[in-house]
Every structure is written in C-alpha cells, then in structure tokens.
Amino acid sequence: MMTGTIETTGNISAEKGGSIILQCHLSSTTAQVTQVNWEQQDQLLAICNADLGWHISPSFKDRVAPGPGLGLTLQSLTVNDTGEYFCIYHTYPDGTYTGRIFLEVLESSVAEHGARFQIP
C-alpha cells in the first residue's frame, strides 16, 4: 500500500531573468527512492538516479542546476517557463509518487511565494 505523501513548494512565482528552486519532499513512507524525474508536461528537465547521479536534459543543460538535494534550480527564467512542473518519485516497493508545482514567471519586480501544499 502506498502510504507516502509528497510535499512541494506549491504555487510559486519568480522574476523574469531570476532563478527558482523547485523542491519536493517524500514523507510518511519507508520506501527507497530509486529515481526522481523532473518534468514539465511530458518534457524532461532532469533526472536524479540513486545509483547514477544527475542527468540534465539537453534542452535545459545551460540553465538547470542539480539540487539542492533532490530538488532542481531553474535559472535565467523567461515567461515561457510559466507552467506546471512535476517531481516524479520512483520508489521501491511503493511505486511512483508525483508532486506538482505551478511556477509563474513575472515581468514585474515583485514575485511572491505561495504557500506549501501536499499531494497524497
């Protein structure tokens, strides 16, 4: 039975040209995390594999930095980066857990961070 929950940074906003940390945390399970995929819709941003380490998609290699931890730092933001991001935790023996983050990239100089929220 899948008992874990993923806590994410929730709905977040950031300034154009700036950077943002996408962060998820899996809790309430003893399952082993074998891999975390970061995706934007069906597009791969990066993978952190427990055995092999990080792989960054070619499309993002110049502006994505691994970490902190299993998170991802997205740099040189553009308005086109606005949208949904998913952290997909592959675990054993539970299976797959998915967390969702919505990022809004703002033109203005004021960007407020939204509240954290959980996805069971």
Epitope: T34, L52, I56, S57
Partner: antibody
C-alpha cells in the same frame, strides 16, 4: 567489446504492429540510455526517442508519440521499440544507439540497423 | 525544432585531398554539435563530439570546428576507407536533429 545487436528485417502489412529488439553486450546496460533513430531514403536521420533501462523512463520526439513505444528488459540487456498502426511512411531502417547517462549527449555506439518494409 | 542543413549532398575528392564538409543550424548551437559517419553498409560511427573533440579510436586526420550556427568537419588526408556519408547532429535542444548528410565519393 561494446555491441548493439538488432533484430532482423521485417516485411509487415499496413495496420500491423512490429517490435524491434536491440541486445546490448560489453557494457553495463542500465548506465546508458538507448536511443532510437529512423532513416528513410531522402529523409536523413530522425531521432525517435530514448529509454533509460532499469528506470523505465522514456522520452519521445513529439512526431513519434503514439507511433513508438519503448521498453527494456534489464535481465537480458535488451531494449525494444514497438511501432503500431504501420503505414508505408514507417518503411525505413531503424537504429538503436547508446548514450551514456549524465551530461554526455552523444551516441557513441550504434546497432547495425533493422530494415522495416510496410507493404500490402 | 532546430533545422540542420548540409548544403552539399554529395562531394567528390581524390585520395590524399583535404576535404571540408559543412553544416549550418537554424539557430545558434553554442558548439553543441556532433559528427557521425555512415558507411555504405549502413554502419554508423561517432567521429567528433562537442564540435571538435575526437572520439576514441577515430583517426587524427578527422577534425571539427565551428561556432554559432556554422560548423565543419575536415578530413585532412583522404583515405579509401573514408568513403561514407557524414551527418552533423545538434544537441542544443530536444528533439535531437540531424543534417541531411553529405555523401563523400572518390574521384
């Protein structure tokens, strides 16, 4: 030494499905992506997509979504590509190649190719 | 998608010649470009990665250069075994895309 041995050529009827195999030897299968590439005369080389064996993570060129499905069997170090609803446009030589996990992005060894002909 | 263009589809040269094959991209690639060789029997090999790095086992007569949108592969002293079709490939953005190929023949 590194080898990617592909299955033999096929003659298939329109509307049918086919599964092409790519058996890897001489390296650690799960440390490399398996890439799939299509070659039609006059159309050059087209990247279909990739799979990371062991993780099940696969990514597709938009053009081939719904046409190709990748799987991999780590116990036999074999990757597969299934092509469905075949038409004459699918007549081509299909290659598998490997790309090291991490930020390498080049296809350093290729299979010998599998020729597929779709004809009634 | 990034379009890769190899304007010369076929090229004829003599043994010992210096041959240059060019490739251009629809947008800047920041040197994120590879070169592959396909022999007449269909065998494909990586020659050059990241614009100018020679893959292991590839003879030093092969070299690559370029920047921005324009790149080239040079064979400094053409040998009979170099008869093949040469493809450039970008990895600046997915999907990976290839040039249409340049077929090299002996005069």
């Amino acid at each position: 030494q590194v080898q990617l041995q592909q299955s033999g050529g096929d003659l298939m009827k329109p509307g049918a499905s086919v599964k092409i195999s790519c058996k890897a030897t001489g390296y650690t299968f799960s440390n490399y992506w398996i890439e799939w590439v299509k070659q039609r005369p006059g159309h050059g080389l087209e990247w279909i997509g990739e799979i990371l064996p062991g993780s099940g993570s696969s990514y597709y060129n938009e053009k081939f979504k719904g046409k190709a499905i990748f799987t991999a069997d780590t116990s036999s170090s074999t990757a597969y590509m299934q092509l469905s609803s075949l038409t004459s446009e699918d007549s081509a030589v299909y290659y598998c190649a490997r790309q090291k996990y991490g930020n390498y992005y080049y296809f350093d060894f290729w299979g010998q190719g599998t020729s597929l002909t779709v004809s009634s | 998608d990034i379009q890769m263009t190899q304007t010369t589809s076929s090229l004829s040269a003599s043994l010992g010649d210096r041959v240059t094959i060019s490739c251009s991209a629809s947008q800047g690639l920041s040197n994120y470009l590879h070169w592959y060789q396909q022999k007449p029997d269909g065998t494909v090999k990586l020659l050059i990665y990241y614009t100018s790095s020679l893959h292991s086992g590839v003879p030093s007569r092969f070299s690559g250069s370029g920047s921005g949108t324009d790149y080239s592969l040079t064979i400094s002293n053409l040998e009979p075994e170099d008869i093949a079709t040469y493809y450039c490939q970008q990895y600046s953005k997915l999907p990976y895309t290839f040039g249409g190929g340049t077929k090299l023949e002996i005069k």
